[in-house]
């Protein structure tokens, strides 16, 4: 077809000089000569559709897209991934070919897939495929632990299947609530991948690595505890294994423990008990119920029962995919200059979230703490009083979740002042975003209290430091007002500040700066 | 660019202290693990440990457990080796080294695979009395 | 721990001759085992990582392969720039270990 365009499409490498992540056209990178990608049309496609070879590119690494189009007259195009349009600026290079690039800054799985872009021309419509892959590589990785019965022994092997291959441990505490915290005297860690002492109050297992560390409660229901106020909830996806254990203690051996799901009892060999005698003479028995592989059908209400105790229930929910719970809608605060102040997220997720806090490009660790309620919360306090945004993002690999947060901090405005030849201009942060006013200094108002009505233009932008607001006052300079001094004052509900600037200097003349709070 | 300099050797007596230190430049430090290893004179190279990105879980070669710590501030981008109890044979050159950088892969907390990438240049540790 | 066997231990070579190094382990490391040159008075360099994928930089006469127990780092055509040691490094478990080194020498 004659009125087809002459395409080329090409790869461009980019060398990081950083590994922070951005999308900015100033970020630090040398580049590759560009590699052809020999755009083809593809036949027995709809409409004209060229493809280009399948880019590889190596996790982390920084390229560039970009087609190179041959064609008279302007374009303009269109890129689209994944269902959502990005933008798109042609340009023309020195030989006047049309230029369109797609730049990916520290490849992600994420960012794999189809990019298709749309290019429409004086002349005729066409499509460009491009196919980005992850280069493969191994991965090291860090599981939860999960656990599975030991053949033929009544005891429990934790398993994380991670690599470099973890340390494992299992955390054990006899105490209640507060003293299991991990430094506790009352915890001992067992740095082994076997358990047979199944009696404990509190146990963990924990499996280490150069990645972290990640742990596994083993869900017990304590016939001898007062039920909580909410049923307790546990989460599994399809194909995990699932183990409960119900505990009882009684002062003799004359109970028996039995577990039913929805008031069937549990199949032979989904179950096993374990006994023993207590320091006090008392008889300890448990019962675990097991599932090697959940599938959909093992949801409900699992029920431990006693001949000598109330018998206790967890709802146990299978689910195919994993999720966050919570509400996304932005917060805005404001807070006084000195007062204590925490972010807070409450969420419910399977599988455990992995989260972040961040502030000005910033990330912080987060932390998490589990409620009673089958909630988890994520409190951040340290923003050292910085207006700004915040943005809370979490995931765990079937989900994703993100929250913003806007802090603003009650304090007087500090005015900036400078001048050029045509024009003075003051700007000022505070809170409340403060109002202007501008004078005029001269014989007859020597305290500067002559308003000037005209020529001034207020506006409010954003800075550097994301989602803090700042507020500027330019006041354009006619000739009569030149060699005359200027007065301009921000004020809030907080208090006013003033800067004193000498029209037609080349710089701010803040010889006063009056503060009236 | 990504840099990695160590300091803190010197020449110490059997049985005292010395502290590493290990600067780093160019990449987000604090989302990688990181490693030091060590070469005693005319010999191989010996891994001596590795702590996590966040600096909660340290890992020790054998021959030094108990008598080193590593650790890391986020902060100022600074990875540590506390080397107490030293011996003679802890004589070396000790390396630091940019372990993987961490992310989420599939659900999983990982990293792809590259390998100690990034070396310092070394500092030389001797025990001698 | 995981032993790393490395050999030769040294070897001679002209420019131009395709030399191989081997290197076994003790156990099954999968293919998390790094190759490093290093040349006197220098840091160790990164050449394969992952038994066979090339360092980004790294020139594409040297190549890995090899998993499990057996791994091998051949360098297809030896450059004056190629004389130095070669480290093999297992990171599937706790302690790391590396080999213990092949230095390639010029006949």
């Known amino acids: 077809n004659q009125d087809l365009p002459v395409i080329k499409c090409v790869l461009i490498n980019h060398k990081n000089n950083d590994s922070s992540v951005g999308k900015s056209s100033s970020y630090p990178m040398v580049s590759e000569s560009p590699e052809d990608l020999g755009c083809a049309l593809r036949p027995q496609s709809a409409g004209t559709v060229y493809e280009a070879a399948t880019v590889e590119v190596d996790v982390s690494a920084s390229i560039t897209l970009q087609v190179l189009v041959d064609t008279p007259g302007n374009i303009s195009c269109l890129w689209v991934f994944k269902h959502s349009s990005l933008n798109c600026q042609p340009h023309f290079d020195v030989q006047n070919r049309g230029v369109v690039s797609m730049v990916i800054l520290k490849m992600t799985e994420t960012q794999a897939g189809e990019y298709l872009l749309f290019i429409q021309s004086e002349a005729t419509n066409y499509t460009i495929l491009f196919t980005v892959s992850i280069r493969n590589t191994l991965l090291f990785t860090l599981r939860r632990p999960y656990f599975r019965k030991m053949e033929n022994q009544d005891a429990l092997v934790c398993i994380s299947e991670s690599v470099p291959e973890p340390i494992v441990e299992w955390v054990l505490c006899d105490s209640q609530g507060e003293s299991c915290k991990e430094e506790s005297p009352a915890v001992v860690k067992k740095e082994e991948k076997v358990l047979h002492e199944l009696f404990g109050t509190d146990i963990r297992c924990c499996a280490r690595n150069e990645l972290g560390r990640e742990c596994t409660r083993l869900f017990t229901i304590d016939l001898n505890q007062t039920p909580q106020t909410t049923l307790p909830q546990l989460f599994l996806k399809v194909g995990e294994p699932l183990w409960i254990r119900c505990k009882a203690v009684h002062v003799n051996h004359g109970f028996g423990l039995t577990w039913e799901l929805e008031n069937k009892a549990l199949e032979e060999g989904s179950y096993f008990e374990m006994s023993t005698y207590s320091t006090n003479r008392t008889m300890i028995r448990i019962l675990f119920a097991f599932v090697s592989s959940v599938a959909r059908n093992d949801t409900g209400y699992y029920t431990c029962s006693s001949s000598k105790h109330p018998s206790q229930s967890a709802l146990v929910t299978i689910v195919e995919k994993g999720f966050i719970n919570a509400t996304n809608s932005s917060e805005d605060y404001e807070i006084d200059q000195y007062e204590e102040f925490c972010f807070s997220v409450r969420f419910k997720a399977y599988p455990q979230i992995r989260c972040t806090w961040t502030f000005s490009r910033k990330s912080f660790p987060c932390e998490q703490k589990g409620l009673d309620d089958g909630y988890s919360v994520s409190k951040f306090c340290n923003h050292k009083h910085q207006p700004g945004e915040y943005i809370f993002h979490a995931e765990n690999g079937d989900a994703q979740f993100t929250k913003m947060f806007t802090l603003n901090i009650r304090r007087k405005p500090q005015v900036l002042a400078e001048a050029s030849a045509s024009q003075a201009s003051c700007s000022s942060d505070g809170y409340p975003l403060p109002s202007w006013t501008w004078k005029k200094c001269s014989d007859k108002s020597p305290n500067c209290t002559e308003d000037i009505p005209e020529g001034v233009w207020n506006r409010k932008a954003n800075r550097k430091v994301f989602g803090q607001w700042v507020s500027s006052s330019t006041l354009n300079m006619s000739e009569a007002m030149k060699g005359f001094l200027v007065k301009c004052c921000a004020y809030n509900s907080l208090g006013t500040s003033c800067e004193t600037i000498l029209l037609n200097s080349p710089g701010p003349f803040p010889f006063i700066q009056d503060s009236i709070s | 660019q990504v840099q990695l300099v160590e300091s803190g050797g010197g020449v110490v007596q059997p049985g005292r202290s010395l502290r590493l230190s290990c600067a780093a430049s160019g990449f987000t430090f604090s989302s990688y693990g990181m490693h030091w290893v060590r070469q005693a004179p005319g010999k191989g190279l010996e891994w001596v440990a590795v702590i996590s990105y966040e600096g909660s879980n340290e890992f020790y070669a054998e021959s030094v457990k108990g008598r080193f710590t590593i650790s890391r501030d986020n902060s100022k981008n600074t990875l540590y080796l506390q080397m107490n109890s030293l011996r003679a044979e802890d004589t070396a050159v000790y390396y630091c080294?940019?372990?993987?950088?961490?992310?989420?892969?599939?659900?999983?907390?990982?990293?792809?695979?590259?390998?100690?990438?990034?070396w310092g240049q070394g500092t030389t540790v001797t025990v001698s009395s | 721990d995981i032993q790393m066997t490395q050999s030769p231990s040294s070897l001679s070579a002209s420019v131009g001759d395709r030399v191989t190094i081997t290197c076994r382990a003790s156990q099954s490391i999968s293919s998390y085992l790094n190759w490093y040159q290093q040349k006197p008075g220098k840091a160790p360099k990164l050449l394969i990582y992952a038994a066979s994928s090339l360092q980004s930089g790294v020139p594409s006469r040297f190549s890995g392969s090899g998993s499990g127990t057996e791994f091998t780092l051949t360098i297809s055509s030896l450059q004056p720039e190629d004389f130095a040691t070669y480290y093999c490094l297992q990171h599937n478990s706790y302690p790391l270990t590396f080999g213990g080194g092949t230095k390639v020498e010029i006949k």
């Open positions: 080294a940019r372990g993987g950088e961490i992310t989420m892969v599939r659900g999983v907390i990982g990293y792809y695979y590259y390998g100690m990438d990034v």
